[in-house]
């Protein structure tokens, strides 16, 4: 059976939107009006992995692009990147672990924990116009809480 996917946008808890920053990076900034069109639309795929009531494994692809968020070690540090894939083979139910995030719902907010690196989360900064990254702390300065907005196909 084909993998189930939905289209969505994400905003951090400061209401910053996510946009492309160069070919292989995302950044977070406040957008208004027509500029909202700049925000990236994700194709969130529901994939194989450890699942519970509040924890669902997903892959985050960029809609109509062969790019997926992935978590890899760079200089011995868990790092978030946009990785190019062969569109003929993706998305798939059994995604490689580096592409998998545990979508965790807490108090109507979402966290995205790396399956590859437990306790590392998709994060943004308080500052405007700075990259989205993989952070190893919750509840500190870095923002790990998001809301999801559904986008019609």
């Amino acid at each position: 059976a084909p993998v189930r996917s939905l289209n969505c946008t994400l905003r951090d808890s400061q209401q910053k939107s996510l946009v492309m920053s160069g070919p292989y990076e995302l950044k977070a900034l406040h957008l208004q009006g027509q500029d909202m069109e700049q925000q990236v639309v994700f194709s969130m795929s529901f994939v194989q992995g450890e699942e519970s009531n509040d924890k669902i494994p997903v892959a985050l692809g960029l809609k109509e692009k062969n790019l997926y968020l992935s978590c890899v070690l760079k200089d011995d540090k868990p790092t978030l990147q946009l990785e190019s894939v062969d569109p003929k083979n993706y998305p798939k139910k059994k995604m490689e672990k580096r592409f998998v995030f545990n979508k965790i719902e807490i108090n109507n907010k979402l966290e995205f924990e790396s399956a590859q690196f437990p306790n590392w989360y998709i994060s943004t900064s308080q500052a405007e116009n700075m990259p989205v990254f993989l952070g190893g702390t919750k509840g500190g300065q870095d923002i790990t809480d998001f809301t999801m907005q559904f986008v019609s196909s």
């Epitope: 990076e25 116009n129 990254f133 993989l134």
Partner: antibody, heavy 118, light 107 residues
Framework: EVQLLESGGGLVQPGGSLRLSCAAS????????MFWVRQAPGKGLEWVSV????????RYADSVKGRFTISRDNSKNTLYLQMNSLRAEDTAVYYC???????????WGQGTLVTVSS | DIQMTQSPSSVSASVGDRLTIICRAS??????LAWYQQTPGNAPKLLIH???SLQSGVPSRFSGSGSGTDFTLTINSLQPEDFATYYC?????????FGGGTKVEIK
């Protein structure tokens, strides 16, 4: 008053290492992104590296990637740049700068000169 | 990487002149552009951020305009202390990049 004071520069042989420090005062250091920017003698400005307030997010210019490491100690209000495998083309004045709105450098230190020569 | 091209690379002007410096980005950077002034032996000083916003404490004779790929820094009525080198810098994406600089000399 915001102050940034770099130290640690000097003469080093090619292949050698150096660690630069930047002592910050007059603002809440732990809340700001920080940059290192360099300027070769008689040349323009070149961005080197950035670090987020928590230290989890770092980025580097291609020219220093794999050789330089940016870090910070928020308890000491200090920014660092560890420079390994130094080359003649790394000779420059190195500035630390506080990152302002959207990615500009709103305050700069006075710079420290690094000379790589045999 | 985004390339930033400044023109002219140097210019001779007189006190009281109106001066315009141009900065072009190799791709759209929205309004994520800053302008700096540097005098010999000193660190750069931020003049303008977000293409048009004057940094606190900077005289109002400095102004910035533009968005997308084409930007200008204008100095109305040059003062003796304005003879310096000016740099633009894009902050749209990493690696951040600077223009090559414009040296403003006394005619």
């Amino acid at each position: 008053e915001v102050q940034l004071l770099e130290s640690g520069g000097g003469l080093v042989q090619p292949g050698g290492s150096l660690r630069l420090s930047c002592a910050a005062s007059g603002f809440t250091f732990s809340k700001y992104f920080m940059f290192w920017v360099r300027q070769a003698p008689g040349k323009g400005l070149e961005w080197v590296s950035v670090i987020s307030p928590s230290g989890h997010m770092t980025r580097y210019a291609d020219s220093v990637k794999g050789r330089f490491t940016i870090s910070r100690d928020n308890s000491k209000n200090t920014l660092y740049l560890q420079m390994n495998s130094l080359r003649a083309e790394d000779t420059a004045v190195y500035y630390c700068a506080r990152v302002g709105y959207g990615g500009n450098s709103d305050y700069w230190g006075q710079g420290t000169l690094v000379t790589v020569s045999s | 990487d985004i390339q930033m091209t400044q023109s002219p690379s140097s210019v001779s002007a007189s006190v009281g002149d109106r001066l315009t410096i141009i900065c072009r980005a190799s791709q759209d950077i929205n309004r994520w552009l800053a302008w700096y002034q540097q005098t010999p032996g000193n660190a750069p000083k931020l003049l303008i951020h977000s293409a048009t916003s004057l940094q606190s404490g900077v005289p109002s004779r400095f102004s910035g305009s533009g968005s997308g790929t084409d930007f200008t820094l204008t100095i109305n009525s040059l003062q003796p202390e304005d003879f310096a080198t000016y740099y633009c810098q894009q902050a749209d994406s990493f690696p951040l990049t600077f223009g090559g600089g414009t040296k403003v000399e006394i005619k």
